[in-house]
């Protein structure tokens, strides 16, 4: 709590401006008037202010608006919505998608804050949807943000943005949202020659089809162990042993670390050991020679 | 290209003047606060005096309080620290400084330029 | 407020990870900046507001921490890292600067 103490002469703000810029702490809470702050929130952003100057200018929002803040003076914020508590957050109605993108584009180059997950849950409960605008705002700023999207949230995520999405921003989803985002990178990157793409759409492979999984094997894309063992275990399954070394290229010699866990120990039980033992790895647990393989679930599916 | 070159640094005795100039290009001068920091030798950095960015206010640390000026002509795109009463423990690099438009930190720094205050 | 950092000196080799400590006399919320500064060139902004990576600073570089304790860590340490680190405060006037921590090699 700041002391109540008197503006001394001359030193009374008749505006917001940088002769503010120097004010003690006791001198801005007693010659900035909070009305006046309110109307001219714009200007702030143009004064380089300490974090306890801009804490006693909060303090006088505070007391003007103590049911929560105008969506007026939201948008013109700017750094001071760094001193923004969620409790804070809470208490605004935010409607606007330019204020949306003004808070955002403040807090630009930080990691995705409780503040900023609060005012996003305050606006999409706003706006009463979670429409394409929005999701394009918030994709463009936080790519992470597809995670924690639920899949039929995902499904209105619009192509061009995954663009933006970094390989790390995917290593929160789980293979549901792959399955919807992989069809839209690949939508998205379906221009670029084979080299490229494969660094473009290796991130959301852990929702691509036994068919892509097969064509890829085609364009000696030698993908990694760790791209490998994100893939879909139902999609790996059918994949040929040739294939598998296709696709992993040199890579392929990492298998044998790998033999006990998912998908790789999935796959060799369902390879006749005769061509595994072809990669020359050691990888035991496939089909004896000799043993008659019956899918049953084709069987199924002609019955 | 965004950019601050010092000069006028140079050896004085104790009790002389000097006057640093900080010729900025490459952004617009009259947006930015500006500050001084020097670095004695072999020491750390000591925040010296800032300005606003019409000029119109200033700062200094205490020890230098009454001893050095800072000014700015925003037409010439210049900052300029007057010292004078000079001491042997103002002996030190003196560097210009472009503040962040948001608060205080420094997001652009001149070379520096050597200031000696020796007899 | 007064900064104090640690190590004063450290010896690491290339590809170490490196953690520099800042510690402040009072809470300063995350009003915080460091440097990076090499032998007779001027400091360059690494990162600022305690967390936030400078634009063109490479991401080996992160800041951590809130109040009075701050970390700056380089994941892998490169041969261009070598150099004196300070860390600065914001919070309120007079700025101060840490006492610097400078990185050599082993």
């Known amino acids: 709590e700041v002391e109540k103490t008197a503006c001394p002469s001359g030193k009374k703000a008749r505006e917001i401006d940088e002769s503010l810029i120097f004010y003690k702490k006791w001198e801005l809470e007693a010659c900035v008037d909070a009305a006046l702050l309110a109307t001219q929130m714009d200007r702030v952003n143009a004064i380089p202010f300490t974090y306890e100057q801009l804490d006693v200018l909060k303090h006088k929002l505070d007391e003007l608006y103590p049911q929560g803040y105008p969506e007026s003076v939201i948008q013109h914020l700017g750094y001071l919505f760094l001193k923004m508590s969620p409790e804070d957050i809470r208490k605004w109605n935010v409607t606007s998608l330019e204020t949306l993108k003004a808070l955002l584009e403040v807090n630009k180059g930080h990691e995705m804050s409780p503040q900023v997950a609060t005012l996003i849950d305050r606006f999409v409960k706003g706006r009463g949807q979670l429409d394409k605008d929005t999701l394009d705002t918030l994709t463009a700023f936080y790519p992470g943000y597809l995670c924690s999207l639920s899949p039929e949230e995902l499904s209105s995520v619009p192509p061009s943005s995954i663009w933006a999405v970094r390989p790390q921003d995917l290593d929160t989803c789980d293979p549901r949202q792959l399955d919807v985002l992989y069809p839209k990178a690949r939508l998205a990157f379906q221009n670029m020659n084979g080299s490229e793409y494969f660094v473009k759409i290796q991130s959301f492979l852990g929702g691509a089809p036994t068919e892509d999984l097969k064509a890829l094997s085609q364009q000696n894309v030698s993908m990694d162990l760790a791209t490998f063992m994100k893939l879909r275990t139902d999609a790996v399954l059918p994949l040929t042993v040739a294939e598998v070394q296709k696709l992993l290229g040199p890579h392929v010699e990492g298998l044998k670390a790998e033999e006990r866990h998912r998908p790789v120990r999935d796959w060799i039980l369902r390879q006749r050991q005769d061509d595994l033992d072809t990669l020359g790895l050691g990888l035991q647990g496939g089909i004896p020679n000799g043993y008659l393989v019956l899918d049953l679930s084709m069987q199924e599916a002609l019955s | 290209e965004v950019q601050l070159l010092e000069s006028g640094g140079g050896l004085v005795q104790p009790g002389g003047s000097l006057r640093l100039s900080c010729a900025a290009s490459?952004?617009?001068?009259?947006?930015?606060?500006m500050s001084w920091v020097r670095q004695a030798p072999g020491k750390g950095l000591e925040w010296v005096s800032a300005?606003?960015?019409?000029?119109?206010?200033?700062y200094y640390a205490d020890s230098v309080k009454g001893r050095f000026t800072i000014s700015r002509d925003n037409s010439k795109n210049t900052l300029y620290l007057q010292m004078n009463s000079l001491r042997a423990e103002d002996t030190a690099v003196y560097y210009c400084?472009?503040?962040?438009?948001?608060?205080?930190?420094?997001?652009?720094w001149g070379r520096g330029t050597l200031v000696t205050v020796s007899s | 407020i007064q900064l104090t950092q640690s190590p004063s000196s450290l010896s690491a080799s290339v590809g170490d990870r490196v953690t520099i400590t800042c510690r402040a006399s009072q809470g300063i919320s995350s009003a915080l900046a460091w440097y990076q500064q090499k032998p007779g060139k001027a400091p360059k902004l690494l990162i600022y507001d305690a967390s936030s990576l400078e634009s063109g600073v490479p991401s080996r570089f992160s800041g951590s921490g809130s109040g009075t304790d701050f970390t700056l860590t380089i994941s892998s340490l490169q041969p261009e890292d070598f150099a004196t680190y300070y860390c600065?405060?914001?919070?309120?006037?007079?700025?101060?600067f840490g006492g610097g921590t400078k990185v050599e090699i082993k």
């Open positions: 490459g952004f617009t001068f009259s947006s930015y606060a």
């Open positions: 600065q405060q914001f919070n309120n006037y007079p700025l101060t």
């Open positions: 300005i606003s960015g019409s000029g119109g206010s200033t």
């Open positions: 400084a472009r503040t962040s438009r948001t608060t205080w930190y420094f997001d652009l």
